[in-house]
């Protein structure tokens, strides 16, 4: 008798590979067992399976669940096996050893080739998937960075607003003191019933051209209603304007005498009409005090 097999078995990746080993013997000859092994491993042969006439198919632990017999009907002289779901690591040399009675043992060797077939459409689909996945990842990262930026900006703006409010409060306190001192002095020097309290003066900071409002359209940057978010610079400028208009000396002790003199001089140039202070008619209608401040 003799063994029928193939020199090379070619299978597509993921498909089942049939490893053929058929004993063509004389009548009355029997196959006792067929041992399949992988034989290109450096450490020696590695058993795949043993097909035994009495005990049936025994798959080696190393190939558990991966080796089967071909579907029925089965010829008792057929020692072929199926290697399930071939992977590239399965590519290599295999042999079957057939023990027969009474003819003895036979062996055959074959090479298993595992082909990797790439479908061009599938491949482009995978590329598209990869690109879209990359875009999503980049988008997510960008969004996270933007959120981080927004948080930083919000925290910074809150910090600056708090600082600005503190400064405004401080200046307003100073301003109030200055105003009270000015009014007191005004009453003590000029007991003229026409003199009006400070609130009557028709000069308002809000109308000053330096009153810079933050009209930014970024809603994240402004938590207050539009037009209420003042920059630190604007707030300081407004306070400076008010201070300069109402009390050039801003209430410091070393300048009190200068300030008294300035108020006296100023009152000589204004006249009370209909509850409002109006400038007395002069050559140019502008009064500049001794310190050079515009009033």
């Amino acid at each position: 008798g003799e063994l029928e097999t193939s020199d090379v078995v070619t299978v597509v990746l993921g498909q089942d590979a049939k490893l053929p080993c058929f004993y063509r013997g004389d009548s009355g000859e029997q196959v006792g067992q067929v041992a399949w092994a992988r034989v290109d491993a450096g450490e020696g042969a590695q058993e795949l399976a043993l097909l035994h006439s009495k005990y049936g198919l025994h798959v080696s632990p190393a190939y558990e669940g991966r080796v089967e017999q071909p579907p029925p009907p089965r010829n008792p002289l057929d020692g072929s096996v199926l290697l399930r779901n071939a992977v590239q690591a399965d590519e290599g040399e295999y042999e079957c050893r057939v023990s027969t009675f009474p003819a003895g043992s036979f062996q055959a060797r074959l090479r298993l080739r595992v082909l990797v077939v790439l479908d061009p459409q599938e491949d482009s689909g995978k590329q598209v998937d990869l690109v879209s996945a990359s875009v999503v990842v980049v988008g997510v990262i960008a969004a996270l960075l933007f959120c981080l930026l927004v948080v930083v900006v919000v925290l910074m703006s809150r910090y600056h607003r708090r600082k600005a409010q503190q400064m405004t409060q401080k200046y307003e306190e100073e301003l109030t003191l200055t105003r009270e001192n000015s009014i007191r002095r005004l009453h003590s020097h000029h007991t003229d019933p026409r003199s009006q309290p400070e609130e009557s003066v028709g000069l308002r900071a809000e109308g000053h051209p330096d009153s810079l409002k933050d009209n930014s359209s970024c809603s994240v940057m402004s938590e207050e209603p539009e037009g209420r978010s003042y920059s630190t610079l604007t707030t300081v400028r407004e306070i400076e304007t008010q201070t300069e208009l109402l009390s050039p000396g801003s209430g410091r002790a070393e300048e009190e005498e200068d300030q008294d003199e300035g108020i006296k001089q100023a009152m000589n140039h204004f006249v009370q009409e209909n509850g409002t202070l109006r400038a007395k008619p002069t050559g140019n209608g502008i009064y500049i005090n001794g310190r050079g401040h515009l009033v």
Epitope: G44, A45, V59, S60, P61, E93, R97, Q107
Partner: antibody, heavy 120, light 111 residues
């Protein structure tokens, strides 16, 4: 380190049964056949059979087909061999053994052996 | 079953000399890839120890003074130079088919 630890010696009466254990450690228990080998005093070695720890499937030397039953307990990574209807001929040292690599041939690792003495 | 016949049954060799042990199989155990024959050493009270696998491949950790050769049905184990610690019984074993079988053993002693 691969280790095969066998149960201690047994003295049993003729006609009785004995169950020898082989506790495996240091490797993937389900990745290798467990073989059993008999050595009578002053004599050569005889291969009894092998068991696949994955599914409990076993192959036997026809001479021991009615004498030995090979089983495994995956949870405890232990292989067992039960010897039935014992006679004085069954007095011997029994070894469990493992192949060098998964599915390769030859016995690279051996248990220390279990001496079974059958005596009235 | 494949029968393995070892010779001689016992052997006495002087230290430093060569010891040669033969094993004959009742049928060929060789393919175009490998010979399915292995050699073991066993000392009293110990389990066997694998020396040579696939007729000529030295097992890891085994001294190079051990070597194996042969194919088909005739195989040889050589020990050279023999050392005191090599006193033991040596067995051949095939794994061509089930049942695997062992040779009768060769007892090596020092002169």
């Amino acid at each position: 380190e691969v280790q095969l630890q066998q149960s201690g010696p047994d003295l049993v009466k003729p006609g009785a049964s004995v169950k020898i254990s082989c506790k495996a450690s240091g490797y993937s228990f389900t990745g290798h056949y467990m073989h059993w080998v008999k050595q009578s005093h002053g004599k050569s070695l005889e291969w009894i059979g092998r068991v696949n720890p994955n599914n409990g499937g076993s192959s036997y030397n026809q001479k021991f087909k009615d004498k030995a039953i090979l089983t495994v307990d995956k949870s405890s990574t232990t292989a067992y061999m039960e010897l039935r209807s014992l006679t004085s001929e069954d007095s011997a040292v029994y070894y469990c053994a493992r192949d060098p690599l998964g599915g390769s041939y030859g016995f690279a690792y051996w248990g220390q052996g279990t001496l079974v003495t059958v005596s009235a | 079953d494949i029968v393995l016949t070892q010779s001689p049954a016992s052997l006495a060799v002087s230290l430093g000399q060569r010891a040669t042990i033969s094993c004959r199989a009742s049928q060929s155990v060789t393919t175009s890839s490998y010979s399915y024959m292995h050699w073991y050493q066993q000392k009293p009270g110990q389990p066997p120890k694998l020396l040579i696998k696939y007729a000529s491949n030295l097992e890891s950790g085994v001294p190079a003074r051990f070597s194996g050769s042969g194919s088909g049905t005739d195989f040889t184990l050589n020990i050279h130079p023999v050392e005191e610690e090599d006193t033991a019984t040596y067995y051949c074993q095939h794994s061509w088919e089930i049942p695997y079988t062992f040779g009768g053993g060769t007892k090596l002693e020092m002169k």
